[in-house]
Interface confidence: low
C-alpha cells in the first residue's frame, strides 16, 4: 500500500493487498476496503460500471464477466484499486465488438483477458487471412490490444483477438474495424453558377457542392460584408466509404435590387478551408442593349456580299428577332445565336447575310429584338456602289448635246471632241450646264446627273464623247458629226463601255 505523510488523508487499503488477483470461475470473490471514510466500491470492465456502498465486496460464484478493476474510494476522493481476473477456460475474452479508429490515431480492440497467464496474446485476421503488413499493435491483458496509427486501408478489416491456451490458438469473436478518415486536404467546393442575373421578385437559388472524406466537414453560405445568417437547405450522400458529398442550397424566394452582391460558400475541416463565390445582380426590369459589330453606314459594290452583324445583351432571354428592309421581313438569309453556351449567357449575335447586292437594294436594313420587358432596334444604311449607266444622250432642238447618267457614288460627266477619224478623244469640252436630278427610285439608290454642251462650237467632222465615271467604273456615249455644205448632221449616237 502507498505510504503517506502524517496528517494528510490517506487512500483506503484493500484486502487482499495485491494489485492483481486471479480466481477461478465459480469461486468466491471477497474484497475488503478499510477506511474510516469509506464511500463506495466501483467495478469497471469495458463500458460496464457497477457500484457497491458496502465496504466488503462479495461475489459468491465468480463468472468471467466479473473480471475487471475494483476501486475503493473514500470521502476525500482518494482511491485504491485491485484487478481481478476470473479464469474461465470457456471464456478467455471479454469483448466489446464496436471498433472505431481515427486515421493516423491509435485505437483499442477491446478484448481484455480473463486469464493473464495465457500466452501469445495478439491479433489475427479473419478466415486465416494475414493482417496488413504495416499493422502494429500492443497487447494489454486488462484493456485489450492497441492498434497503432490506424490506416485508411484498414477500413472494414475483420480481425480476432487471439491467445494460445494449452498449445492451441483460441480466437475471440470477430471485430470489424471502422476507420474514420483524417482530413488531409481542404474540402473541394464548387457552385452551380458563378453569376446570376434576376429581375426583382424572381427566386434566387444557388447550390454549393462540398466534397470531402467525411460528413464532419463544416460548410455555410455567407454574404460578403454581412453577418446576416442565410437560410440554406442541405442534401448529402456517401459515395463509398471516404467520399462524402453535401449540397447546400441557398434560396431568396423574392429577390430585391438590394440583394445584389457576392455570396460565398465557405467550407472547412481540420486541415484547412476553401471557398467559392457567386455574384447576384438583381435589376428592376429587363433590358436589351445592341452593339453593331460593323459601321451602321455601309458602302458595298454592286454584285458583292455584305454581312450586317450585331451583338446584343438581352435579359430576360430574347423572344422575337427580325431583320426588316422596305417594310418587308427577311425569312431567311439571317441567323441568331447565343455568344456562348454558358447557362449565364445574356449576349447574343445576329447576322444578316446580303449576297450579290444590286444597285436597287441599297437602303435601311433594321434589326429588331424584343423580350418580355423591352423592345430595341438598330438601323444600317446600306449604299450600293454602281458604275455609271448612261440613261439618255440626245441632241436637243436648241442644238445642245445632252447626256444623262446614273450611278453611285454620283457620277461625273466629262465631254471630249475627237476631230476627223481620230480614235482618241483628248480635247475636253466644258459643259454648258450640269444638274443633279432627283431620282424617282428609293433613297440610297443611284444618283442621276445631267450634263449639256453646245454643239454649235464644233466646226469640223468628228466624234463627241460623253464620259460618265465614278469610283466603280466608267461608261461613254459618242455623237458622230458630219458636215454637208453648211448643214451639220448628227449621225446616230452609240455607247461604248470603257472599263
Amino acid at each position: 500500500q502507498p505510504s503517506v505523510s502524517p496528517g494528510e488523508p490517506s487512500p483506503p487499503s484493500i484486502h487482499p493487498g495485491k494489485s492483481d488477483l486471479i480466481v477461478r470461475v465459480g469461486d468466491e470473490i471477497r474484497l475488503l476496503c478499510t477506511d474510516p471514510g469509506f464511500v463506495k466500491w466501483t467495478f469497471e470492465i469495458l463500458d460496464e460500471t457497477n457500484e457497491n456502498k458496502q465496504n466488503e465486496w462479495i461475489t459468491e460464484k465468480a463468472e468471467a464477466t466479473n473480471t475487471g478493476k475494483y476501486t475503493c474510494t473514500n470521502k476525500h476522493g482518494l482511491s485504491n484499486s485491485i484487478y481481478v481476473f476470473v479464469r474461465d477456460p470457456a471464456k478467455l475474452f471479454l469483448v466489446d465488438r464496436s471498433l472505431y479508429g481515427k486515421e493516423d490515431n491509435d485505437t483499442l480492440v477491446r478484448c481484455p483477458l480473463t486469464d493473464p497467464e495465457v500466452t501469445n496474446y495478439s491479433l489475427k485476421g479473419c478466415q486465416g487471412k494475414p493482417l496488413p503488413k504495416d499493422l502494429r499493435f500492443i497487447p494489454d491483458p486488462k484493456a485489450g490490444i492497441m492498434i497503432k496509427s490506424v490506416k485508411r486501408a484498414y477500413h472494414r478489416l475483420c480481425l480476432h483477438c487471439s491467445v494460445d491456451q494449452e498449445g492451441k490458438s483460441v480466437l475471440s469473436e470477430k471485430f470489424i474495424l471502422k476507420v474514420r478518415p483524417a482530413f488531409k486536404a481542404v474540402p473541394v467546393v464548387s457552385v452551380s453558377k458563378a453569376s446570376y442575373l434576376l429581375r426583382e421578385g424572381e427566386e434566387f437559388t444557388v447550390t454549393c457542392t462540398i466534397k470531402d472524406v467525411s460528413s464532419s466537414v463544416y460548410s455555410t453560405w455567407k454574404r460578403e460584408n454581412s453577418q446576416t445568417k442565410l437560410q440554406e437547405k442541405y442534401n448529402s450522400w456517401h459515395h463509398g466509404d471516404f467520399n462524402y458529398e453535401r449540397q447546400a442550397t441557398l434560396t431568396i424566394s423574392s429577390a430585391r435590387v438590394n440583394d445584389s452582391g457576392v455570396f460565398m460558400c465557405y467550407a472547412n475541416n481540420t486541415f484547412g478551408s476553401a471557398n467559392v463565390t457567386t455574384t447576384l445582380e438583381v435589376v428592376d426590369k429587363g433590358f436589351i442593349n445592341i452593339f453593331p459589330m460593323i459601321n451602321t453606314t455601309v458602302f458595298v459594290n454592286d454584285g458583292e456580299n455584305v454581312d450586317l452583324i450585331v451583338e446584343y445583351e438581352a435579359f430576360p432571354k430574347p423572344e422575337h428577332q427580325q431583320w426588316i428592309y422596305m417594310n418587308r421581313t427577311f425569312t431567311d438569309k439571317w441567323e441568331d445565336y447565343p455568344k456562348s453556351e454558358n447557362e449565364s449567357n445574356i449576349r447574343y449575335v445576329s447576322e444578316l447575310h446580303l449576297t450579290r447586292l444590286k444597285g436597287t437594294e441599297g437602303g435601311t436594313y433594321t434589326f429588331l429584338v424584343s423580350n418580355s420587358d423591352v423592345n430595341a432596334a438598330i438601323a444600317f444604311n446600306v449604299y450600293v456602289n454602281t458604275k455609271p449607266e448612261i440613261l439618255t444622250y440626245d441632241r436637243l432642238v436648241n442644238g445642245m448635246l445632252q447626256c444623262v447618267a446614273a450611278g453611285f457614288p454620283e457620277p461625273t460627266i466629262d465631254w471630249y471632241f475627237c476631230p476627223g477619224t481620230e480614235q482618241r478623244c483628248s480635247a475636253s469640252v466644258l459643259p454648258v450646264d450640269v444638274q443633279t436630278l432627283n431620282s424617282s427610285g428609293p433613297p440610297f439608290g443611284k444618283l442621276v446627273v445631267q450634263s449639256s454642251i453646245d454643239s454649235s462650237a464644233f466646226k469640223h467632222n468628228g466624234t463627241v464623247e460623253c464620259k460618265a465615271y465614278n469610283d466603280v467604273g466608267k461608261t461613254s456615249a459618242y455623237f458622230n458629226f458630219a458636215f454637208k455644205g453648211n448643214n451639220k448632221e448628227q449621225i446616230h449616237p452609240h455607247t461604248l463601255f470603257t472599263p
Epitope: R97, S98, C126, Q127, K129, A153, H155, R156, L157, C158, K174, I176, K178, W237, H238, H239, G240, D241, F242, N243
Partner: antibody, heavy 119, light 107 residues
Framework: EVQLLESGGGLVQPGGSLRLSCAAS????????MSWVRQAPGKGLEWVST????????YYADSVKGRFTISRDNSKNTLYLQMNSLRAEDTAVYYC????????????WGQGTLVTVSS | DIQMTQSPSSLSASVGDRVTITCRAS??????LNWYQQKPGKAPKLLIY???TLQSGVPSRFSGSGSGTDFTLTISSLQPEDFATYYC?????????FGGGTKVEIK
C-alpha cells in the same frame, strides 16, 4: 446514373457450378463494398457474400462458405460470384447490391438473376 | 450470427392508416439498422439507414427509430404505392442479416 446488371443465372444440376456477373456503371467499383443477396422463391432476403472496396476483405454466409467465391475485376467494373458444389437449397434470385458506405445500407440493387439447381 | 426478428409477419391496413413494423436484434447493433421495401418481382429499395436517416428520394411519411436491439419503421399515412414487403437488416456485423419480412396488404 448508377446501374447494376446481373447475368449468368440459369438451370444447373446439383453439384454443378455457375459464375454470376454483375456489371456496374455510373460509379467506380473500387470506391464501394459490394454484396450478393439472394431470395429463394416465396422467401425472404438472405445475405450471401460481401467484398470490400479494395477487394482485400471478403465475407461469406455460413451456408455458402467454402463453396462460393466473391471477386471483382476493377478494370471491367464487374463483380463476380463463383458458385461451386451447388445444392437445391441454393435455388434463388441472386441480386448484387452496392454498400452506400460506412454500412449505411445497400443503396443500389440489380434486377436479379435466377439460379435454379435441379436434376 | 446476429438474428433479426420482425413483427408482425403480415398486416392488413387501409390507405391513410398509420402503420408500425418492429424489428428486434438478438444483440445490440447500435444504430447499424437499415429498412428496405420490396414489391413483387422487383429488387429491394433502401428506405432508411442508420436506424432513422431517410434515404434520398424517399417520402417523408416513412420514418425509423430505435437503437441497440429494438427498432421501428413507421408509415404515417399509408399510400396505395406502399403496399409491399418490408425488411430490416443489420450491418453491425460483417455477416449481414435480414429480418424475415413484413407484408403490408390492403384491407
Amino acid at each position: 446514373e448508377v446501374q447494376l446488371l446481373e447475368s449468368g443465372g440459369g438451370l444447373v444440376q446439383p453439384g454443378g457450378s455457375l459464375r454470376l456477373s454483375c456489371a456496374a456503371s455510373g460509379f467506380t467499383l473500387t470506391s464501394y463494398a459490394m454484396s450478393w443477396v439472394r431470395q429463394a422463391p416465396g422467401k425472404g432476403l438472405e445475405w450471401v457474400s460481401t467484398i470490400s472496396g479494395s477487394g482485400g476483405y471478403t465475407y461469406y454466409a455460413d451456408s455458402v462458405k467454402g463453396r462460393f467465391t466473391i471477386s471483382r475485376d476493377n478494370s471491367k467494373n464487374t463483380l463476380y460470384l463463383q458458385m461451386n458444389s451447388l445444392r437445391a437449397e441454393d435455388t434463388a434470385v441472386y441480386y448484387c447490391a452496392r454498400d452506400s458506405g460506412y454500412d449505411r445500407g445497400l443503396d443500389y440493387w440489380g434486377q436479379g438473376t435466377l439460379v435454379t439447381v435441379s436434376s | 450470427d446476429i438474428q433479426m426478428t420482425q413483427s408482425p409477419s403480415s398486416l392488413s391496413a387501409s390507405v391513410g392508416d398509420r402503420v408500425t413494423i418492429t424489428c428486434r436484434a438478438s444483440q445490440s447493433v447500435r444504430t447499424y439498422l437499415n429498412w428496405y421495401q420490396q414489391k413483387p418481382g422487383k429488387a429491394p429499395k433502401l428506405l432508411i439507414y442508420d436506424a432513422s436517416t431517410l434515404q434520398s428520394g424517399v417520402p417523408s411519411r416513412f420514418s425509423g427509430s430505435g437503437s441497440g436491439t429494438d427498432f421501428t419503421l413507421t408509415i404515417s399515412s399509408l399510400q396505395p404505392e406502399d403496399f409491399a414487403t418490408y425488411y430490416c437488416q443489420q450491418s453491425y456485423s460483417s455477416s449481414i442479416t435480414f429480418g424475415g419480412g413484413t407484408k403490408v396488404e390492403i384491407k
